[in-house]
Amino acid sequence: QKSSIEKCSVDIQQSRNKTTERPGLLNCPIYWQQLREKCLLFSHTVNPWNNSLADCSTKESSLLLIRDKDELIHTQNLIRDKAILFWIGLNFSLSEKNWKWINGSFLNSNDLEIRGDAKENSCISISQTSVYSEYCSTEIRWICQKELTPVRNKVYPDS
């Protein structure tokens, strides 16, 4: 039995995978910040995790996926206020009892030191200094990402 959050992220991922081609993104759009091969958009408004996920989708992007600790640190360096929290694309899968990225992969336990509980209806946020488990219904800011690719590319599930 999938939770509504799991269903929502799976639906969004499937609809993204139906697209076979899209123009490569040479530069980050206005208001987006470049971080290596990604463009990031830090929201100024707040939303629960589900709504944040949907908002990124409407922007033809996804909630932020973080590959490793190095990328986490570089992303955190872009956060100006230490007290502000941002949703990323990671939530607790009740069926698998594990943290799951919205692209379907599981969290490598060494990548992020999560503070807070790992349980149903928990989603992950980051601040300037830490990574927190929060109730998914909490209204905080969020980070969308677009991959920066210089050529036309086939679209596969994000990894």
Epitope: G116, E134, T138
Partner: antibody, heavy 119, light 107 residues
Amino acid sequence: EVQLVESGGGLVQPGGSLRLSCAASGFTFSSYDMHWVRQATGKGLEWVSAIGTAGDTYYPGSVKGRFTISRENAKSSLYLQMNSLRAGDTAVYYCARDSGGLSYAFDIWGQGTMVTVSS
Amino acid sequence: DIQMTQSPSAMSASVGDRVAITCRASQGINNYLAWFQQKPGKVPKRLIYAASSLLSGVPSRFSGSGSGTEFTLTISSLQPEDFATYYCLQHNSYPPTFGQGTKVEIK
């Protein structure tokens, strides 16, 4: 079940010492900041001390130099060493957990342990 | 240190009344504010976190609002079990500070 259980309270003379303990269970103790909060009879809540996940400690001026907070992650235990106790330290002492974020800030409290400083 | 000024310190109200309790922070605390309910001889119980998020199991008659420095706890229709003392807490920065409490009594 997530639980915090305090112990170590009692009657002590002014100038004396007492060590409070807080035993945690049901959660990953090491990933939480921990706090001591006290409440004198008929009074409000007063924050007493905190210890971060890295062992960093915090105190208000009223107890600085007299109280020492510590933690033992392997035993999921929190401690408060109270020295040079005064009548004004008489209160129920609670331990509470705090993730540092929003959802789990001061969300779980122990049942409290009574400290009475009197001659 | 951030001071939390809670008002009123006490109030008398009747069952069914709408009750509002305010907490004012001496400086901005974002939404790092929680509200607690405490009954005599009992442990404080968190009702609201992140200024306006209602905890699971807490009746919907409780609501929180505000941001920055001004925060309000509202009970839309006071019930007999709501007579208690309410505290706000800021945990935006050390030291965490509580409001002095508001005792809601039966009129």
